[in-house]
């Protein structure tokens, strides 16, 4: 039994780090493998993660992380019974994938303006709270070509757009994701999408 693709890990910088790897053949990850992880800190204990299957030869492990800080560094040991298959390390702050924003709401009652709001997925005392910026994806259910991305580079989790920038009388969907430049994170997953019917008063044309 050998590791074909070494574990790579990302952290939500709050509670979970996810490590994925591939074996050289079909593997029952949960019965055959264990991923041990330990904070590099005096007297820190080792924790065991039981991996789940992620495709035939793929495995995934969700590591519960202690109260994460930027200096934290973990040793990782992948075992098959008594055989050490791989040894590595992981610094959560250098491999961050933020949590997805939540509670995306489209407010359509603001005089021909669409107001999209969502919630920051971190509590105020988490380092990422004040460092997230967002991308909002809006698309038409009727027209696949009507697909747009708005970059929200300010901290407030909201976006205002004129309803007239979208077509009237059709349904749209929106979703939002986050990233933090300060930690050079990857993008979060997209939030669940929300749907609304876009309608606005066409400006009166004078002849």
């Amino acid at each position: 039994m050998k590791v074909l693709q070494e574990p790579t890990c990302v952290s939500d910088y709050m509670s979970i780090s996810t490590c994925e790897w591939k074996m050289n053949g079909p593997t029952n990850c949960s019965t055959e493998l264990r991923l041990l992880y330990q904070l590099v800190f005096l007297l820190s204990e080792a924790h065991t993660c039981i991996p789940e299957n992620n495709g035939g030869a793929g495995c995934v492990c969700h590591l519960l992380m202690d109260d994460v800080v930027s200096a934290d560094n973990y040793t990782l040991d992948l075992w098959a019974g008594q055989q050490l298959l791989w040894k590595g390390s992981f610094k959560p702050s250098e491999h961050v994938k933020p949590r997805a924003p939540g509670n995306l709401t489209v407010h359509t009652n603001v005089s021909d303006t669409l107001l999209l709001t969502w919630s920051n997925p971190y509590p105020p005392d988490n380092y990422l709270y004040n460092h997230l910026t967002y991308a909002v994806n809006i698309w038409s259910e009727n027209d696949p070509a009507d697909f747009r991305i708005y970059n929200v580079t300010y901290l407030e989790p909201s976006l205002r757009i004129a309803a007239s920038t979208l077509k009237s009388g059709i349904s749209y969907r929106a979703r939002v994701r986050a990233w933090a430049q300060c930690y050079n994170t990857t993008w979060s997953e997209w939030s669940p999408s929300t749907k609304w019917h876009n309608s606005y008063r066409e400006p009166f044309e004078q002849h």
Epitope: S15, I16, R99, G102
Partner: antibody, heavy 120, light 107 residues
């Protein structure tokens, strides 16, 4: 072996005070966040409070039902967690569990609990 | 606050049965859901974290699934020691909240 041992429970009159303690052993207490969770007689579980580690400035969080009445603290040199409970109400009657937090709310070890009874 | 609703509130089953308990969140919590087991007079024990990850030392007959708002705990073949009360808990947002519990009894 991880061990959490609560103490300090007892019978107290409404408006009174109690201080619960939780002695921790078998793990690196000073790097872990800790919680208190309670369970009223015959009822479900209710999260009460959380305290983070020193590296996160001992930040505390409280359920609305206990905010401004309960105070959470820790002494890392003694591996001990404390819950100071003031202005106690009858609805605070419960078994109080000390828990280790292994990731912003995933509580992997629990003490055996200490019973607090608030009654006149 | 996020409300967690478990069903059923009680359940009778026999040793060897396959049992499913469901938990519903009042809003999307991604996969930030834990399951605990509690026996009478004892403290709860963590069974499953992050929806489907088995906590160390927990038998593989326990499994979890779901995402978003709907989650499931499954015991593939009930053992005598599994008769207990089970709680789900979200750790997406403070305050962390628990379901009302499902009491699993011997038929």
């Amino acid at each position: 072996e991880v061990q959490l041992v609560e103490s300090g429970g007892g019978l107290v009159k409404p408006g009174g005070s109690l201080r619960l303690s939780c002695a921790a052993s078998g793990f690196t207490f000073n790097t872990n966040a800790m919680n208190w969770v309670r369970q009223a007689p015959g009822k479900g579980l209710e999260w009460v409070a959380r305290i983070r580690s020193k590296s996160n400035n001992y930040a505390t969080y409280y359920a609305d039902s206990v905010k401004d009445r309960f105070t959470l603290s820790r002494d890392d040199s003694k591996n001990t967690l404390y819950l100071q409970m003031n202005s106690l109400k009858t609805e605070d009657t419960a078994v109080y569990y000390c828990t280790r937090d292994r990731g912003w709310g995933a509580m992997d070890y629990w003490g055996q609990g200490t019973t607090v009874t608030v009654s006149s | 606050d996020i409300q967690m609703t478990q069903s059923p509130s009680s359940l009778s089953a026999s040793v060897g049965d396959r049992v499913t308990i469901t938990c519903s969140a009042s809003q999307d919590i991604n996969n930030y859901l834990n399951w605990y087991q509690q026996k009478p007079g004892k403290a709860p024990k963590l069974l499953i974290y992050y929806t489907s990850s088995l906590h160390s030392g927990v038998p593989s007959r326990f499994s979890g699934s779901g995402s978003g708002t709907d989650f499931t705990l499954t015991i593939s073949s009930l053992q005598p020691e599994d008769f207990a009360t089970y709680y789900c808990q979200q750790f997406s947002n403070l305050p962390w909240t628990f379901g009302g519990g499902t009491k699993l009894e011997i038929k």
